[in-house]
């Protein structure tokens, strides 16, 4: 017969669970079963046998069940035995996460991860994560082996930050036992981090002010930062430092205040983990009356103008008014009182009205005084700009700016600007003698350039008032600049050429640069050097030139700024005519004769005359004197063709003749080979 045990060889059971071992036989009708432990300790289990099967049940599994169990089956005289080892473990719960206190930003906290009722502890491992970050991990393999359930923990201290809000804290416990189902050997607990911020930066804003008048109202708003958002409580400190609770809102409004409402008000921000307070002191004062003087503490009045000073009592039902000057000089004005107002009218102010005026208001035996300074000035006209002459590029010019009838001139500033550039600035700070109207002048010299055209010359006069007035009185004059440029780069173009043949047309064109555009004047220079005016056109035209049109022609560019002059010489030439080529004594001579070849041109004295003898090897120029060439003793080789060319710049004429030379012996003619 055969014996089998199930599960085979080895099994694992969790403490507190139930576990069944089954022993069965085949090939035996009525076997006898017996169970024992390898070391013969108590079974700590129940046995139930039915036919060929015996079941050993451990319920609940405990440390006493960690053994090798043996099943013995007897069939007749046969006996068979099988063993199975039972390992036990305990891993019943998910780990627990504990904190040493609430998680407060910036304050270290210890987090503890506990794995409860573990067996065997040496097989335990714990990981602790914050989000994706491993904070710590520990294995407990060095722990003593004891047959008991133990709770093991892993601790980490960290300082929470704002970014930790909402992060998950994960505690993962693993029990490294082969046979446990993977779902059982790893347990984890996840806790979302609840991070707190104790109330801080508690601040109070008070509107309109902490110093108040009787009957007034105040609104105080308190804010406090924290997580969760702090609740706000308002209280008032009593004499014994006890707080009198006033409100549970962020805003506390007090109306119709009395002097006894003065005191220290406390605002407190409170949340789950802390509190933070701020204090403010309110001072409620008795309501005073106020004296107001208008137009202001300083009044600027132009000579001849009228000034109205108004004094008002605010917060007083029946005031009495009085006016005086600081120096107690007589008042030149008219006073009019109307209820809570009094006016002093100064008509047509002059230098004698320049004072500090004081208005005194009496209300229920209390007198308040307010002053205003009346400053007299004169600044009636815009400045006047004058220049020493027209503006010419590169030529210095003097500009003066005159400001008439000014008072007080020791407050005067004159500035002269060219475009955006200050040419000169002057403060007239010299001591004033008697009070009078004065005319002040600012003078400067500058060199205009062409770039200044289009810019403006600005004379700016500022009359600065007393310290109180921020903006000075200002007047200005503007003069656009137009800079002249003396004519320059005067140029003459001659078309077609300054050397011409008699009868040809010619154009002489002149241009000149300058501002304003120069006027053109054509003249002819006479022999005595004087100029004979010809034309005011830019172009001087000769339809048909004559020989006596030759000469020097002068073009002048003229404008307000100067003159520029340029000249050109015109040469009129005559083309050669009536050219004559003669031979003496005759065209046919004997060997040894003297021969004279002459070339003359009747109409042109200044001409080039070239005498040539034609030859196979090329023309040979003959040395002629005044167009004549003499052959002293004619040779046979002197025979040939002679050519005369008369040339000027405008043309040329050509004549030729043939000279024969006869030999002495046989009277034969000798002709050149041409």
């Amino acid at each position: 017969f055969k014996i089998e045990i199930s599960p085979e060889y080895k099994t694992i059971a969790q403490i507190g669970d139930s576990m069944a071992l089954t022993c069965s036989t085949t090939g035996c009708e009525s076997p006898l079963f017996s169970w024992r432990t390898q070391i013969d300790s108590p079974l700590n289990a129940k046995v139930r046998t039915e036919g060929s099967k015996s079941v050993l049940t451990m319920e609940p599994v405990s440390f006493e069940n960690e053994h090798s169990y043996l099943c013995t089956a007897t069939c007749g005289s046969g006996k068979l035995e099988r063993s199975i080892h039972v390992d036990i473990y305990s891993f019943p719960k998910d780990p627990e996460i504990q904190f040493s206190g609430p998680l407060e930003v910036g304050k270290p906290v210890t987090v503890k991860c506990l794995a409860p009722d573990i067996y065997p502890v040496y097989r335990l491992e714990i990981d602790l994560f914050k989000g994706d970050q491993l904070m710590n991990r520990q294995e407990f393999s060095s722990e003593e082996m004891t047959k008991s359930l133990e709770t093991k923990s892993l601790e980490v201290t960290f300082t929470p930050v704002i970014e930790d809000i909402g992060k998950a804290l994960v505690c993962r416990a693993k029990l490294h036992i082969d046979q446990i189902d993977s779902t059982l050997k790893e347990r984890e607990t996840v806790k979302e981090l609840q991070v707190y911020i104790s109330p801080r930066n508690t601040t109070i804003s008070v509107h309109p002010s902490t110093r108040l008048q009787e009957g007034g109202a105040v609104t105080m708003t308190c804010s406090s930062e924290g997580l969760p958002a702090p609740e706000i409580f308002w209280g008032r400190k009593l004499d014994n430092e006890v707080l009198q609770l006033l409100s549970g809102n962020a805003t506390l409004t007090l109306i119709a205040m009395r002097m006894e409402d003065s005191g220290v008000y406390v605002c407190e921000g409170v949340n789950l983990i802390g509190r933070d307070k701020a204090e403010v002191e309110l001072v409620v004062q008795e309501k005073p009356f106020i004296v107001d003087i208008s137009p202001g503490s300083q009044v600027a009045a132009q000579v001849g103008d009228s000034v109205v000073l108004t004094c008002a009592a605010i917060g007083c039902d029946s005031p009495s008014f009085s006016w005086r000057t600081q120096t107690d000089s007589p008042l030149n004005g008219v006073v009019r009182n109307e209820g809570a107002k009094s006016t002093l009218v100064l008509s047509s102010v002059g230098f004698e009205d320049e004072h500090s005026y004081l208005c005194a208001v009496t209300c229920l035996q209390r007198t308040l005084e307010k002053r205003t300074q009346v400053e007299v000035y004169s600044f009636p006209e815009d400045p006047v700009i004058k220049m020493s002459g027209p503006l010419v590029h590169g030529r210095p010019v003097t500009v003066n700016c005159t400001v008439p009838n000014v008072y007080p001139f020791d407050h005067l500033e004159i500035e002269l600007l060219k475009g955006e550039t200050t040419l000169m600035k002057k403060y007239f700070l010299e001591e004033m003698g008697i009070k009078s109207l004065e005319t002040k002048i600012l003078e400067t010299t500058f060199i205009p350039t062409i770039e200044d055209t289009g810019k403006s010359l600005v004379c700016l006069a500022r009359l600065h008032s007393g310290e109180m007035e921020s903006e000075p009185k200002q007047r200005q004059s503007v003069q656009p600049l137009y800079v002249n440029v003396a004519p320059k780069e005067t140029t003459i173009w001659v078309s077609p050429s300054p050397i011409l043949e008699e009868g040809s047309p010619v154009n002489l064109t002149c241009s000149s640069d300058g501002i304003p555009a120069p006027k053109i004047l054509w003249s002819r220079q006479l022999n005595n050097g004087e100029l004979q005016p010809l034309s005011e056109n830019t172009t001087l035209t000769f339809m048909s030139t004559k020989r006596d049109d030759s000469g020097i022609y002068v073009c002048e560019g003229i404008n307000e700024a100067g003159i520029s002059r340029k000249s050109v010489e015109l040469i009129i030439q005559v083309s050669p005519k009536d050219i004559q080529l003669t031979v003496f004594p005759s065209k046919s001579v004997k060997e040894g004769d003297t021969v004279i070849i002459s070339c003359t041109c009747g109409n042109v004295p200044e001409t080039w005359i070239i005498l040539k003898k034609k030859a196979k090897t090329g023309d040979m120029v003959l040395k002629s004197v005044d167009g004549s060439y003499t052959i002293r003793q004619a040779q046979l080789q002197d025979a040939g063709i002679y050519e005369c060319e008369s040339k000027t710049e405008v043309g040329s004429q050509l004549r030729s003749l043939t000279l024969d030379v006869k030999g002495k012996e046989h009277n034969k003619d000798y002709f050149s080979p041409e």
């Epitope: 491992e125 491993l134 710590n136 991990r137 294995e139 393999s141 060095s142 201290t157 490294h176």
Partner: antibody, heavy 118, light 107 residues
Framework: QVQLQESGGGLMQPGRSLNLSCVAS????????MTWIRQAPGKGLEWVAS????????YYPDSVKGRFTISRDNAKSTLYLQMNSLRSDDTATYYC???????????WGQGTLVTVSS | DIQMTQRPASLSASLGETVSIECLAS??????LAWYQQKPGKSPQLLIN???SLQDGVPSRFSGSGSGTQYSLKISGMQPEDEGVYYC?????????FGGGTKLELK
């Protein structure tokens, strides 16, 4: 008594691979975490890798993560360290120790020298 | 990672002299500290674990103490066989880290 015997060290070129072994005896091998620790010449000790009882959990420092693999064969009572993409700064004596990353290292092998040089 | 700093880096002691080696952790390690001795050319040997528990077979002249971030190893009466390098190691926070070592020589 507990004995740990490393082998497999030697001279290797950078970028190459090497496998170290450690044969354990004198204790029930599968009842302990095992760890490799190294010591560069003339330098201190550095933890290299740890493996749990069955090999289910393995841990490494950033310096070797992704290049080294620790494993074990409980049937052969042998611990391994597969070292890939070797670098010159991996030159060290490699010790096989009994114990996990949180435990004191009570038993050490005699060490095997790995030299990485071109 | 927790930094472990050992002081001094090296020291010489006369025979019978009492020697102290300090180990400083960059944060609290709750006594999870071990001390090792490494003799020239040998493997390290565990002397003390849990900051103060002496391993079996380790002479009683060796003792460990400390808490929080400060720990020390004391040798009460230096012997020739105590020459070597001593290392501390924390196992409190992953990953495990060692001190740089203290070289102890006999004067």
């Amino acid at each position: 008594q507990v004995q740990l015997q490393e082998s497999g060290g030697g001279l290797m070129q950078p970028g190459r691979s090497l496998n170290l072994s450690c044969v354990a005896s004198g204790f029930t091998f599968n009842n302990y975490w095992m760890t490799w620790i190294r010591q560069a010449p003339g330098k201190g000790l550095e933890w290299v890798a740890s493996v749990s009882f069955t090999g289910g959990s393995t841990y490494y420092p950033d310096s070797v993560k992704g290049r080294f693999t620790i494993s074990r064969d409980n049937a052969k009572s042998t611990l391994y360290l597969q070292m890939n993409s070797l670098r010159s700064d991996d030159t060290a004596t490699y010790y096989c120790t009994r114990g996990g990353y949180s435990s004191p290292f009570a038993y050490w092998g005699q060490g095997t020298l790995v030299t990485v040089s071109s | 990672d927790i930094q472990m700093t050992q002081r001094p880096a090296s020291l010489s002691a006369s025979l019978g002299e009492t020697v102290s080696i300090e180990c400083l952790a960059s944060e609290d390690i709750s006594n999870s500290l071990a001390w090792y001795q490494q003799k020239p050319g040998k493997s390290p040997q565990l002397l003390i674990n849990g900051a103060s528990s002496l391993q079996d077979g380790v002479p009683s002249r060796f003792s460990g103490s400390g808490s929080g971030t400060q720990y020390s190893l004391k040798i009460s009466g230096m012997q020739p066989e105590d020459e070597g390098v001593y290392y501390c190691q924390q196992g409190y926070k992953y990953p495990p880290t060692f001190g740089g070592g203290t070289k102890l020589e006999l004067k």
